[in-house]
Amino acid sequence: VKSKIGSTENLKHQPGGGKVQIINKKLDLS
């Protein structure tokens, strides 16, 4: 089974692809 999605758990339901952005999260390792 193929998957184009890693996880939608943290995604807000958007009305289309026009508002989607790639989010880079910084890890706090201090």
């Epitope: 999605i5 995604l11 339901h13 026009g18 508002k19 989607v20 952005q21």
Partner: antibody
Amino acid sequence: QVQLVQSGAEVKKPGSSVKVSCKASGYTFSDYVISWVRQAPGQGLEWMGEIFPRSGSTYYNEKFKGRVTITADKSTSTAYMELSSLRSEDTAVYYCARDYYGTSFAMDYWGQGTLVTVSS
Amino acid sequence: DIVMTQSPLSLPVTPGEPASISCKSSQSLLNSRTRKNYLAWYLQKPGQSPQLLIYWASTRESGVPDRFTGSGSGTDFTLKISRVEAEDVGVYYCKQSFYLRTFGQGTKVEIK
């Protein structure tokens, strides 16, 4: 395998309501949007609206706002589309489709369709 | 609302010959952040539910024959069939998902 199984054909009177169901299996129901699309006899495809089952969040085609309600029951992996104040122009085949929300935003699996006939 | 316009609306084809369908949107479908065009192509064979052929304007859905190719960006898109086969007959729809969803009117492909 992924399957979307819709409820059977309906005959309704003008002014009444219809509720069509779409039972999903073979994937995690909460992870994908369910869209509803209709097709009048001999006509093209028309998007009605969608629901993200995890949150219950919905978006609707302005044309149907106030007349259509889309809901989802996570416990049974079933989505519903209710259309009210039916008129003869609502006679159509109604499809549910799994929408790859979050990436391709494309409908990769479709139900078999439900014919709704509105007639007095 | 985003309006999708397909042409031609009817396309008689000869098996083995190429075919091309155009789809134009009233506004750009390109997300500059993701660098994706939110345009998909579907085929509805007679008596069947629609099936996904292409998404992101040019990415073939798994299982779709490589004779189907999608191209274009922004507002102008094209679906090409390199060599039409009898099983390719039906109605082809483009659909935008940049904002909500809108389908084109459909292009009926039939064998000459």
